[in-house]
Amino acid sequence: IINGSDCDMHTQPWQAALLLRPNQLYCGAVLVHPQWLLTAAHCRKKVFRVRLGHYSLSPVYESGQQMFQGVKSIPHPGYSHPGHSNDLMLIKLNRRIRPTKDVRPINVSSHCPSAGTKCLVSGWGTTKSPQVHFPKVLQCLNISVLSQKRCEDAYPRQIDDTMFCAGDKAGRDSCQGDSGGPVVCNGSLQGLVSWGDYPCARPNRPGVYTNLCKFTKWIQETIQANS
């Protein structure tokens, strides 16, 4: 997150970290069910661990943390590497979470976002770009949903209805390492960090997010079929 600020503790209990061993964070994810996460399809790895209820980036033990293995990762069948359409994936955890103030699911919004909607994006991704500098704790940033026209103008011939753009002033954006993390609008999960320009936070080059309102049926049906 570029030019965000430290999230208040306990305010993002659905935020998950996807870790490669030993403790290397490579993507964010979102708890949407007691045993299921959503993340970006481009975050798929065969071997990874899931950390929930953790505030700092470092692997230091925190009393609220819960660790999991992913037993199944199900990318949206319409995703195409290295493209950006349908960039979402469900991950089934090896057990159900223990609900606490630090670990709790969020509902996926069935309403598509309208321009001007205020949202919050969070993650442990780099706080500088093109340099790489990772934060000590989870970062939060307020962003606004842009109209689909402004989105298409920013990225001609690259935007479809499985994506939406959001941003703030130049210099504020999600970035590498935030992928798969949540965009929360009006208390519901509206999007996942998907892609954007490089370096991040360039003028008139907003962040692009997976438009989850288009996938509520797939999410529900996939969880039911694999539970």
Partner: antibody, heavy 117, light 110 residues
Framework: EVQLQESGPGLVKPSGTLSLTCAVS????????MSWVRQPPGKGLEWIGD???????DYASWAKGRFTISQDSSKNQVSLKLSSVTAADTAVYYC???????????WGQGTLVTVSS | AYDMTQSPSSLSASVGDRVTITCQAS??????LAWYQQKPGKAPKLLIY???TLASGVPSRFKGSGSGTDFTLTISSLQPEDFATYYC????????????FGGGTKVEIK
């Protein structure tokens, strides 16, 4: 050097049990999923199953119940056990490492197992 | 069922030819497809993963493309060392799978 080496008996009697070992060197099992694949003489590759560092195991539908995949991280080895073998289980058996992006990037040389009395 | 069908099962070609092998999945596997080359008496070798990403040390004459259900391996100019059998493998799911591999395509000298 990153290397996999399968070992086990070259000949097994029908209805017997086959046990194969894959010795892993050059990388820790804790970081990778491992696969077992077999190839009957003159035929194609057949996926048997995968084992993950967490000891989660996926088997091909036809392999469930007959094959058992396990690992010993302290010895850095993966094992494959097959009960009630028949002539149809005659094959070259390979272990392989997944590169974490769903491609098998390191393979053992394979070990030929013949089922015959 | 996610069955993988390769075609052709064999083909004859000459050095310098452009060769195309196809792999079809019975359901969408997105981009989780790998290609392997196997020579007689040897273990398979990874050529391409994620449908189009070239594995380390693989010559650029090998190219993978496709997504969803239809995938292609193209060898732009066949070299003597390319005569071998090629297999595709899906990595989309391991659930209720008979085989993750396609049946193979043998590339022979014309």
């Amino acid at each position: 050097e990153v290397q996999l080496q399968e070992s086990g008996p070259g000949l097994v009697k029908p209805s017997g049990t086959l046990s194969l070992t894959c010795a892993v060197s050059g990388f820790p099992l804790s970081n990778y999923a491992m696969s077992w694949v077999r190839q009957p003489p003159g035929k194609g590759l057949e996926w048997i199953g995968d084992i993950y560092p967490s000891d989660i195991i996926d088997y091909a539908s036809w392999a469930k119940g007959r094959f058992t995949i396990s690992q010993d991280s302290s010895k850095n080895q993966v094992s494959l056990k097959l009960s009630s073998v028949t002539a149809a289980d005659t094959a070259v058996y390979y272990c392989a490492r997944d590169n974490n992006d769903y491609g098998l990037d390191i393979w053992g040389q394979g070990t030929l197992v013949t089922v015959s009395s | 069922a996610y069955d993988m069908t390769q075609s052709p099962s064999s083909l004859s070609a000459s050095v310098g030819d452009r060769v195309t092998i196809t792999c079809q999945a019975s359901q969408s596997i997105s981009s989780w497809l790998a290609w392997y080359q196997q020579k007689p008496g040897k273990a398979p070798k990874l050529l391409i993963y994620l449908a189009s990403t070239l594995a380390s040390g693989v010559p650029s004459r090998f190219k993978g493309s496709g997504s969803g259900t239809d995938f292609t391996l193209t060898i732009s100019s066949l070299q003597p060392e390319d005569f071998a059998t090629y297999y595709c493998q899906q990595g989309y799911t391991n659930s209720n799978i008979i085989n993750t591999f396609g049946g193979g395509t043998k590339v022979e000298i014309k």
